[in-house]
């Protein structure tokens, strides 16, 4: 949580961003809050990235002004405007790409001052994984995949009987480059695995930690999954 | 409401310059929510989207056309139009204008009823 | 450019019939998906935009649904006026392009 007072001859106000993690080809969001004003037509929004010459975003007079906007966000950008009178600032970006990563700082004026926190905005792809059991192999194995993953993760074995054991040489992980040639889809297979268990498959780089689940008995089958970005911090 | 109203000559020569301009009325182009753009449709055909202009000025062309395609903006007429150079046959279409939904939604609404250009000698 | 493909192409019911018409992307477009109505001589109509959200003053007999890279256009049950070529269009990223039309016609 990045909490920014403002330092003019104004009163200042308290902006608050948090930090997040954006999935490429999706849509994100990025989290900015403010003290409210009672009139509309007083708040202007603007969002700026270091390194960027021109705004990301901006809103004034109760309507976006995108005249300065820089080309790389070109019709990417809306703030969620029936929100701003209530103090939301935060930023809808659309088709986030790898290169929309980096510090960005969100800058707001009202009646009553100005002020602006930073964000740090990570991007990259993360996805769910499904562990299956794998009948076509000689063995009892188990599959794992996720389709989008960047940049390459580390993938981890665990089982609840044997807590602690390492999988490493009964697995295998092969990561496969995907169409758009960014993103890879993970594919990990686990050997010998034994019955009236829990395998847990977790898949993690810097944004994001997934972990799927299967326990096999003699008479079904479970699956759980999960996935938790690793860097929401507020400022 | 927004209404969108295309003008222009219904027919231009192969090599020459179609000029299309589209007036804006029940609202103000200036309005800083909303991308502009021109659309055509070729002769039983699909749509082909030609590029946007917001009311700054700041364009973005299809690739496809980008070496022939030049929009521009009048405020004070609340209008914006379209030029497309060196144009054969194959420009023949229907020429739409119309507006998008929002700065990060670009679905269509409203549209102009569209213009027929016929390119002949 | 993202291609879009739209599928069938030209599809024959009758009044009061439930009509599924199809389009995919070439690349995942998250929800930007857009439908429009267009009938002869007249400009395309906006029904769906965002993938499912319905377009005000159109009729709730139209519904989409779809994310990603597959996206269905429904009309519950066909009405007379609903006689006419359907169209979608992506605005995920630019260029932005459409499909190619489904013209629904009278069986």
């Known amino acids: 949580l990045i909490i920014g007072f403002g330092i003019s001859g104004r009163h200042s106000i308290t902006v608050t961003t948090v930090a997040s993690a954006g999935n490429i080809g999706e849509d994100g969001i990025l989290s900015c809050t403010f003290e409210p004003d009672i009139k509309l037509s007083d708040i202007v929004i603007q969002w700026l990235k270091e390194g960027v010459l021109g705004l990301v975003h901006e809103f004034k007079e109760g309507k976006d002004e995108l005249s300065e906007q820089d080309e790389m966000f070109r019709g990417r950008t809306a703030v969620f405007a029936d929100q701003v009178i209530v103090g939301n600032a935060s930023l809808r970006l659309k088709n986030v790409q790898l290169t929309d990563a980096g510090t960005y700082k969100c800058y707001i004026i009202t009646s009553k001052g100005k002020g602006n926190a930073n964000l740090e905005y990570k991007t990259g792809a993360f996805s769910m994984p499904e562990v299956n059991v794998d009948y076509n192999a000689s063995s009892e194995t188990l599959r794992c995949e996720a389709p989008r993953w960047f940049p390459q993760p580390t993938v981890v074995w665990a089982s609840q009987v044997d807590q602690g054991a390492n999988f490493s040489e009964v697995s295998n992980t092969s990561f496969e480059l995907n169409s758009e040639n960014v993103t890879m889809k993970v594919v990990s297979v686990l050997y010998n695995v034994t019955i009236n268990n829990t395998y847990s498959c977790m898949i993690e780089n810097d944004i994001a930690k997934a972990t799927g689940d299967i326990k096999v008995t003699e008479s079904e089958i479970k699956r759980r999954s999960h996935l938790q970005l690793l860097n929401s911090k507020a400022s | 409401q927004v209404q969108l109203q295309e003008s222009g000559p219904g027919l231009v020569k192969p090599s020459q310059t179609l000029s299309l301009t589209c007036t804006v009325s029940g609202g103000s182009i200036s309005d800083g929510s909303y991308y502009w753009s021109w659309i055509r449709q070729h002769p039983g055909k699909g749509l082909e989207w030609i590029g946007n202009i917001y009311y700054s000025g700041s364009t973005y062309y299809n690739p496809s056309l980008r070496s022939r395609v030049t929009m521009s903006v009048d405020t004070s007429k609340n209008q914006f139009s379209l030029k497309l150079s060196s144009v054969t046959a194959a420009d023949t279409a229907v020429y739409y204008c119309?507006?998008?939904?929002?700065?990060?939604?670009?679905?269509?609404?409203?549209w102009g009823q569209g213009t027929l250009v016929t390119v002949s000698s | 450019d993202i291609q879009m493909t739209q599928s069938p192409s030209t599809l024959s019911a009758s009044v009061g019939d439930r009509v599924t018409i199809t389009c995919r992307a070439s690349k995942s477009i998250s929800s930007w998906l857009a439908w429009y109505q267009q009938k002869p001589g007249k400009a395309p109509k906006l029904l769906i935009y965002?993938?499912?959200s319905l377009h005000s003053g159109v009729p709730s007999r139209f519904s989409g649904s779809g994310s990603g890279t597959e996206f269905t256009l429904t009309i519950s049950s066909l009405q007379p006026d609903d006689f006419a070529t359907y169209y979608c269009q992506q605005d995920n990223s630019y260029p932005y392009t459409f499909g190619g039309g489904t013209k629904v016609e009278i069986k």
């Open positions: 965002e993938a499912s």
């Open positions: 119309a507006r998008g939904l929002s700065t990060i939604d670009e679905a269509f609404d409203p």
